[in-house]
Interface confidence: low
Amino acid sequence: DAHKSEVAHRFKDLGEENFKALVLIAFAQYLQQCPFEDHVKLVNEVTEFAKTCVADESAENCDKSLHTLFGDKLCTVATLRETYGEMADCCAKQEPERNECFLQHKDDNPNLPRLVRPEVDVMCTAFHDNEETFLKKYLYEIARRHPYFYAPELLFFAKRYKAAFTECCQAADKAACLLPKLDELRDEGKASSAKQRLKCASLQKFGERAFKAWAVARLSQRFPKAEFAEVSKLVTDLTKVHTECCHGDLLECADDRADLAKYICENQDSISSKLKECCEKPLLEKSHCIAEVENDEMPADLPSLAADFVESKDVCKNYAEAKDVFLGMFLYEYARRHPDYSVVLLLRLAKTYETTLEKCCAAADPHECYAKVFDEFKPLVEEPQNLIKQNCELFEQLGEYKFQNALLVRYTKKVPQVSTPTLVEVSRNLGKVGSKCCKHPEAKRMPCAEDYLSVVLNQLCVLHEKTPVSDRVTKCCTESLVNRRPCFSALEVDETYVPKEFNAETFTFHADICTLSEKERQIKKQTALVELVKHKPKATKEQLKAVMDDFAAFVEKCCKADDKETCFAEEGKKLVAASQAALGL
């Protein structure tokens, strides 16, 4: 529908509260360094303008596109050049180039201070003093640190955040009530951000076709009773929603997501039997619930895939007539039969099938040529199965922390040029696959593990893209979206790497480590482990384990000492000397 005023249309559809929240998210995701107060001022100005357009859609400037209105507003920021440098050059461009320019300057790793959680009483006072500002600040802080966070989902997180404070600030034991809820929101938020980042990378780096293939596979697993036409419609709508959100069109994205949830609930009889509970919830909860809904049961009487895709004499005819539709049908049929496969595996199988048809449909005897295509799938299926089995065994043997350390060593040896904080962050997240997925039975392990690893490896890819240092990382990240994990798995020790110079300062620790949380202490130790491997990439597991055990004992000893700082200074020197000797540094 063409609307005289796009801003009025979205304001009316979304309502003032959601409109303001989404504009704040959009601005914070673009101008990540701007102070909170500046953003609030800009949002209020946009909101007041939107209200004039609601009152009279013909009023001046109300016919302008949202990109034009928002871009003009962002370009009024006085310190744009000083704060953002070359991003200020975006303001010299016209739409749509200006918006594209802003998008390209989004920073996945902005130089912002870590969010420190204040005392519970301090938070509760702030919440009670000014609830609206408190919640806006939450949106702002998350959005600027996660510039691709799925905006309508962030509204859902904010709603839960508010509910947690509303309940817990009246509780007898505020901390016991609030802290687990905040921990859960933080962990879920990080996971949600990373999942959405992969969707945006898929769209932006590999195109709409790649995203649609992913969506066909995932929705077919989730809704195996739905017809192919129904799945295709959902895929088209979902692609539009994510294209909008990844492109910074947050008002359109939230509006279209609400429409999609409405459609799904109105047509749940032809989509899935698992949607009933979701569809009884309010809008934000409903959309979240649908996105997370469990797979429906597979129809009992599904025929063999071979009939339509191998044995039929019409395979090449059907393929030639509408390649993507035919491949989409193949992917749909395979995925709905295999909830036990990861989405990326299903996409590898579809790619293999496509390559085979491309080759065979031009051959003298096409059927003879593609008759054994399903045999080519066996090694593709077995590779992730074996990898997951081996790694879950290792995880169960070591526990999460030591499993993370094994991955830290493995990945540092593969790509030692990558920055230490990135290697620590990515390897810690890779290691979490154990706790997340190894508890599942066989049938759920692969979709859990491999699709999670795709999300984590995408974090490595986007962080590395900002400052590329390794050709091997660039190669694995850019060649094929679905083969990223096998590509990284196949990397061996980088023999071309020149070991880092030894620097005693890197291994100097102070008494402040004693007051850190267990997680922060682990990160310190893991940072030292990465540095150790960078100095001595040929060190054996046993050598590294010995040094790390000594290091743990040293920290424990000095944290119990009366004069902690002296202990760290003196014992630290001894530890460095002993480690150098043990590793031959």
């Epitope: 687990p180 809820k181 921990d183 859960e184 526990g399 999460e400 154990g434 706790s435 190894c438 508890k439």
Partner: nanobody
Framework: EVQLVESGGGLVQPGGSLRLSCAAS????????MSWFRQAPGKEREFVSA????????RYAESVKGRFTISRDNSKNTLYLQMNSLRAEDTAVYYC????????GGQGTTVTVSS
């Protein structure tokens, strides 16, 4: 399939004691941190206590500190919660969960503290 089965609940007088157990199966128990949560009638689930995979690191809600003790026996795949000096406000259904997530767990065991 992952299974968590809580037991040991019952009716007890204020000041009394109970020991809850949680038998785990379907996953490698010794590799995961575990928690106890509880839910009183008409209230949200609340965190009670947590223990790391090896049993060394334990956490408690302020309201139970000094009265409850969490422990585990990895050889028996079992999590425990020793509850002493019980109060009326401890009345709830107690659930054990994997990790620190309040959203997953077994069916629960009911503890009623009343005179």
């Amino acid at each position: 399939e992952v299974q968590l089965v809580e037991s040991g609940g019952g009716l007890v007088q204020p000041g009394g004691s109970l020991r809850l157990s949680c038998a785990a199966s379907g996953f490698t128990f010794g590799s995961f941190g575990m928690s106890w949560f509880r839910q009183a009638p008409g209230k949200e689930r609340e965190f009670v206590s947590a223990i790391d995979s090896g049993g060394a690191d334990t956490r408690y809600a302020e309201s139970v500190k000094g009265r409850f003790t969490i422990s585990r026996d990895n050889s028996k795949n079992t999590l425990y919660l020793q509850m002493n000096s019980l109060r009326a406000e401890d009345t709830a259904v107690y659930y054990c969960t994997i990790g620190r997530s309040a959203s997953r767990g077994g069916q629960g065991t009911t503890v009623t503290v009343s005179s």
